[in-house]
């Protein structure tokens, strides 16, 4: 057979679907690998072929499109399961070809089981809601294309195991779930079950997402440097270890990059010759506000080092701040024995 552009196994698109539910899987070639869509390919005389490798097998085999009730079918660039079975798990390949052209990609499909409370090994998308921010919504994801707009499905929302009908400041509104006010108590897994009829059968789509309530932009502030501050002086003798923590609080900001760095005499530590190490730790509050601590350490400080300027810097989407640490050389304690002897000698 002629050469085929093989994009390999696209593990980035690990597709997970629930057992005994419809699944529609688009061939990833047109979405991520080729610069043209299925319609263009089809009108150019290219054919889309599907095959698969069962779980724990090496043998590629064609997909059986002659199952009862057309359980597996293909429509344009979509592979349909109505519904899935557990043993549909495997690696699926779609190949686009004609006599002169060939391109293919494989992707893993995992059919997973869920319990009566919708717990499963499914990786859940996370939707962030701002705390105490007014009405916000989540939408039942990935249900487009399963039924025509003329079909009116029934949608039932659950928080964890419980049907949402009158609690927690949450109003189910069809495909949307509206939060009158989002609070920490709203954190959790939300499931929409979409029920629709098709050809005399009833199908269910189950979609679960995790809601995480985060800090509101209304309350967001520029970074706050708690340390170094004006109350602490780092007083060291040459030869001692100098440890200066830079502790910075960052309000949660969607898609903000929080940065903390030290400068020594206006330069990044990497750009100077002294032996300095920096260790960073990060902690988060319940609303994903962030506290970053960078500890600057000089194992054996010299008197030169104790004259340098040590400045902690922080930056977020809300602004940039800096604070200098108060570093000084310890003055040696007075030698009282000598002074007293001198004193007595003078009388």
């Amino acid at each position: 057979s002629e050469r085929c552009d093989d994009w390999g196994l696209d593990t980035m698109r690990q597709i997970q679907v629930f057992e005994d539910e419809p699944a529609r899987i688009k061939c990833p070639l047109f979405e991520h690998f080729l610069k043209f869509n299925y319609s263009t390919a089809h009108s150019a005389g290219l054919t889309l072929i599907w095959y698969w490798t069962r779980q724990d097998r090496d043998l590629e085999e064609p997909i059986n499109f002659r199952l009862p009730e057309n359980r597996i079918s293909k429509e344009k660039d979509v592979l349909w399961f109505r519904p899935t079975l557990l043993n549909d798990t495997g690696n699926y390949t779609c190949m686009l070809r004609n006599t002169t052209y060939c391109s293919k990609v494989a992707f893993p499909l995992e059919v997973v089981q869920k319990d009566s409370c919708f717990n499963s090994p499914m990786k859940l998308p996370v939707h962030k809601l701002y705390i105490e921010y007014g009405i916000q919504r989540i939408t039942c994801p990935n249900v487009d294309g399963y039924f025509p707009s003329s079909v009116k499905p029934t949608i039932t929302w659950y928080m964890g195991c419980y049907k949402i009908q009158n609690f927690n400041n949450v109003i189910p509104e069809g495909m949307n779930l509206s939060f009158l006010i989002a609070l920490i108590s709203n954190n959790g897994n939300y499931t929409c079950v979409v029920t629709y009829p098709e050809n005399g059968r009833t199908f269910h789509l189950t979609r679960t997402l995790t809601v995480k309530v985060v800090g509101s932009p209304k309350n967001a502030v520029p970074p706050v440097i708690h340390s170094p501050n004006d109350h602490v002086v780092y007083e060291k003798e040459p030869g001692e270890e100098l440890l200066i923590p830079c502790t910075v609080y960052f309000s949660f900001l969607m898609d903000s990059r929080n940065e903390v760095w030290w400068t020594i005499d206006g330069k990044k530590p990497d750009d100077i010759t002294i032996d300095v190490t920096i260790n960073e730790s990060i902690s988060h509050s319940r609303t994903e506000d962030e506290t970053r601590t960078q500890i600057l350490s000089i194992k054996k400080v010299t008197s030169e080092d104790l004259k340098r300027s040590y400045v902690c810097h922080a930056r977020s989407a809300k602004g940039e701040v800096a604070k200098a640490a108060k570093v000084k050389q310890k003055v040696p304690a007075p030698r009282y024995t000598v002074e007293l002897a001198c004193g007595f000698g003078a009388t």
Partner: antibody, heavy 125, light 113 residues
């Protein structure tokens, strides 16, 4: 559990057009900090019920108003006093009504399972 | 704005009979509807929420049904104590810029003969 309404005196409030009045509603037997909404509903003499607005009674003062309110009314709450209040400003004769406070249980927007006894507000010159 | 239209008013039936009150929403409010009973000189009393769930302490003679834009309150085995005005209350969060829109129906007076 009850909601005790006050404001405008025992006989209700007689206010001149353009005037202001504050109506309050005190919770007893339950705590406002238990995350309830305090909502206000009014009823003109011989007419139907009309939703005014709701305030979230716990830590935040999230408020929602009916579109017709147009900023003339303000909802507030005092957790320490277990009280929710409705400030009425720029009153007109059309605002003459019995004003009820109600507790929305669960934050569903429509489940008003506990009501105050109502305060009659009369706007007249 | 959300508009709730109630019919008919008034409605009358004999003791032991059945009364059906309809409520129509101008928008799809799914199941976000409650029914209230109000007697003269009293505040309203919650009967049903989430379109069909009976509030605590309410007799099972009261039942609610419907979703979307069409809702019904049914009182079966009518008693003289059921003489009152009944209101539906709908809620939706996607019409107003404000975000939360509640609207009562105009009320239906039930007369018990």
């Amino acid at each position: 559990q009850q909601l005790e309404q006050s404001g405008g005196g025992a006989e209700g409030g007689l206010v001149k057009p353009g005037g202001s009045l504050e109506l309050c509603c005190k919770a007893s037997g339950f705590s406002l900090s238990s995350a309830y909404w305090i909502c206000w509903v009014r009823q003109a003499p011989g007419k139907g019920l009309e939703w005014v607005g709701c305030i979230y009674a716990d830590s935040s003062s999230i408020t929602y108003y009916a579109s017709w309110v147009n900023g003339r009314f303000t909802l507030s709450r005092d957790i320490d006093q277990s009280t929710g209040c409705l400030q009425l400003n720029s009153l007109t004769a059309a605002d003459t009504a019995m004003y009820y406070c109600a507790r929305d249980y669960g934050g569903s927007g429509y489940n008003f399972n506990l009501w105050g006894q109502g305060t009659l507000v009369t706007v007249s010159s | 704005a959300l508009v709730m239209t109630q019919t008919p008013s008034p409605v009358s039936a004999a003791v032991g009979g059945t009364v059906t009150i309809s409520c129509q929403a101008s928008e799809d409010i799914y199941s976000n509807l409650a029914w209230y009973q109000q007697k003269r000189g009293q505040p309203p009393k919650l009967l049903i929420y989430y379109a069909s769930t009976l509030a605590s302490g309410v007799p099972s003679r009261f039942s609610g049904s419907g979703s979307g834009t069409e809702f019904t309150l049914t009182i079966s085995g009518l008693q003289s104590d059921d003489a009152a005005t009944y209101y539906c209350l709908g809620v939706c969060t996607y019409i107003n810029a404000n975000g939360w829109d509640n609207a009562f129906g105009g009320g239906t007076e039930v007369v018990v003969k």
